[in-house]
């Protein structure tokens, strides 16, 4: 007679990533007798929240519970009822929330305080909700791509189990880009880190990692724009601004104080004559990239060498994944091709800068028109960011791997986060076992 | 203290418009969102709306939505609500409330001192 | 729109007197329910929140009670300063709404 499957033994975890543009909830799946294992973890879920970051329901916390209602019934769904209690829930914010305690540790508090009473209501473990430092959220974005690509196995294979692998244990660099910050970190080649905030050391299965990680708040790419209109309207002669990081036709009304609101622009704000401007596009991506580059100081470093603001970075060693928001947009412009070089980048984006509004319009008539207006503000941002801010050249541009998802997880912080808080990563390698037999009888 | 203190009373014909300010002292602004409330005269009270002194997000009962504008100096901590094209049934007092968060929910806890907006031609 | 009900529009009592003054909201709107004084020609005070929590600084005498459809406000020990409007408001649900107010007259 077959054999038959006896019912599997496995556990769940939920992490949800409160991002300073929406909130998204990930369900995590691993055999329970594998704990220990590197790789063993993978996504089986992931549910965007409708709606804005938790940052964005100041004055209206009353509505958060409402807000997470459908992801969270949706992991009641995915997850077996008999698993609910065991299965631990984690969430973790990000940036938006870093500005808004900022600006007031109470409102901050208050929305936490609101999250944690919603969540506390499913029938899950929940481990709480807390604002991680940028430091955390570019080292679990570290651990989670090495992960999933395998690099913390001390077994070598003959063969690639994911793209990217180059068959080494050389870890590969993680490069995140939010709304309201963006992440570095890697492994510097013998190189000392000169700054003791940026220097992260993990003994991982049994290896030490000496990790280089810096967080820059107020430039992901939702704040960078913020701050960069803060800049150009300083110097505009009246309440219109003419941008070359929008598109040729291109119009939109802006609220100077709605501009002023981040703490990201205090340093730009000014009192002006007008309360509205409208920014009017023109398309060019060469004074677009020249406006951004303003945003970047580089004439103070108290270091060997820095990225910009006078914060200390390495040289770039090894390969690096550049995910989230750098995945997403590349991948809207169609430049996440390995085989596309960074000059190539260039040209794309010059003339995807240059194409009238309208025209864009209808190519792309499915997309919001908010999020359609700014891919030539963001691509270029990213180009800019890459090369400028953190000195990747066109040779090394080939290094960078833009990722969404490996092995079918997302690429991002959640899963190390989850990782970590469940102790799945030990610190010595675990004493191999002799396979199981117990999945069938 | 905390204080909400409102334009004075405004005297308008028919198809005018009208700003009352609402100037907030004693509190940090953006932290706490502005209600607006109509009484007529001889009547209760008519919740008109509420405006997020922090993200600039409006909201409008049914009843206020098209004539009714609700905005913001936020560097004058102060709150304006507008209304278009006067008809005499909007002759009524204007009040301004502060809408603050209180075990679990948002009340009004402050209040106005009113504007009287008369409309006659 | 739930409807908040005050079936009394006016009341009549005396110094030193205990009255209650009632509300019916048309839906559960659980405890989210406020009620305010205004005296004539000023502005609603806030009294109760929640149903029955007092605001700092308003008396003692003052007290809330109910949940769901049925809320009452009582004053025991009635003061001539008491002589106002008292008007029940549900925000529980946009879009807010305020009962038609109770009279309180002191004889």
């Known amino acids: 007679t077959q054999n038959k499957a006896l019912p599997e033994n496995v556990k769940y975890g939920i992490v949800l990533d409160a991002g300073s543009s929406h909130t998204s909830l990930y369900i995590y799946k691993w055999p329970a007798e594998k704990e220990n294992d590197t790789g063993v973890v993978h996504q089986v879920e992931e549910c965007r929240v409708k709606g804005p970051g938790i940052s964005k329901f100041v004055q209206k916390v009353n509505e958060i519970g409402i807000y997470l209602t459908d992801c969270m019934e949706r992991a009641r769904e995915v997850i077996p009822r008999s698993q609910h209690q065991e299965t631990p829930v984690y969430l973790g914010a990000t940036a938006g929330m870093r500005l808004l305690r900022m600006e007031s540790e109470e409102l901050a508090d208050r929305v936490l305080d609101v999250v944690e009473r919603s969540l506390s209501n499913y029938p899950f473990d929940f481990q709480g909700a807390r604002i991680i430092t940028g430091q955390e959220e570019g080292a679990y974005g570290w651990i989670t791509i090495n992960y999933l690509l395998g690099k913390f196995s001390q077994k070598t294979r003959w063969f690639s189990i994911v793209p990217y692998e180059t068959n080494n244990q050389e870890t590969f660099g993680a490069l995140d880009l939010g709304g309201a910050s963006t992440q570095v970190t890697f492994v510097p080649q013998n190189q000392t880190i000169e700054s003791p905030d940026n220097a992260l050391q993990f003994r991982l299965y049994g290896k030490d990692y000496n990790v280089y990680t810096h967080s820059f708040l107020c430039y992901g790419k939702d704040q960078a724009l913020w701050q960069k209109l803060a800049k150009d309207i300083q110097v505009a002669s009246n309440e219109i601004l003419r941008d070359p990081c929008f598109h040729p036709g291109y119009k939109k009304v802006v609220n100077v104080s709605d501009l002023y609101k981040t703490p990201c622009t205090k340093r730009f704000e000014m009192t002006l004559p007008f309360q509205q401007f409208e920014i009017q596009g023109i398309g060019n991506y060469q004074q677009c990239h020249q406006s951004i580059l303003e945003l970047f100081n580089t004439s103070y470093c108290p270091y060997s060498q820095c990225a910009f603001n006078g914060i200390f970075l390495p040289p770039l060693q090894g390969d690096f994944g550049a995910f989230s928001a750098f995945y997403f947009v590349m991948k809207f412009l169609n430049l996440t091709s390995e085989k596309v070089s960074q000059e190539k980048v260039t040209e794309m984006m010059k003339k995807f800068c240059a194409q009238p509004w309208e025209e864009i319009k209808t190519s792309y008539a499915g997309v919001k028109e908010k999020y359609l207006s700014e891919y030539c503000f963001s691509g270029t941002y990213i180009l800019s960011l890459l090369l400028q801010g953190y000195h990747f050249t066109a040779d090394s541009w080939e290094h960078i791997h833009f990722i969404g998802k490996i092995q079918g997880s997302d690429a991002g912080w959640t899963l190390g986060y989850m990782l970590n808080l469940t102790n799945m990563i030990p610190a010595e390698q675990p004493l191999s076992t002799p396979l199981s037999h117990s999945t069938y009888v | 203290q905390i204080q909400l203190v409102q334009s004075g009373p405004e005297l308008k014909k028919p198809g005018e418009t009208v700003k009352i300010s609402c100037k907030a002292s004693g509190y940090t602004f953006t932290h706490y969102g502005m209600n607006w409330v109509k009484q007529a005269p001889g009547k209760g009270l008519k919740w008109m709306g509420w405006i997020n002194t922090y993200t600039g997000e409006l909201t409008y009962a049914d009843d206020f939505k098209g004539r009714f504008a609700f905005s913001l100096e936020t560097s004058a901590s102060t709150a304006y609500l507008q209304i278009n094209n006067l008809k005499n049934e909007d002759t009524a007092t204007y009040f301004c409330?502060?809408?603050?968060?209180?075990?679990?929910?948002?009340?009004?806890?402050?209040w106005g001192q009113g504007t009287s907006v008369t409309v006659s031609s | 729109d739930i409807v908040m009900t005050q079936s009394q529009k006016f009341m009549s009592t005396s110094v030193g007197d205990r009255v209650s003054v009632t509300c019916k909201a048309s839906?559960?709107?659980?405890?989210?329910v406020a009620w305010y004084q205004q005296k004539p020609g000023q502005s609603p005070k806030a009294l109760i929140y929640?149903?029955?929590y007092r605001y700092s600084g308003v008396p003692g005498r003052f007290t809330g009670s109910g949940s769901g459809t049925d809320f009452t406000l009582t004053i025991s020990n009635v003061q001539s300063e008491d002589l106002a409007e008292y008007f029940c408001?549900?925000?529980?649900?946009?879009?807010?709404?305020f009962g038609g107010g109770t009279k309180l007259e002191i004889k």
């Open positions: 839906h559960n709107v659980g405890t989210n």
């Open positions: 408001h549900q925000y529980n649900n946009y879009p807010y709404t």
């Open positions: 409330a502060r809408r603050a968060y209180y075990r679990y929910d948002y009340v009004m806890d402050y």
């Open positions: 929640s149903a029955s």
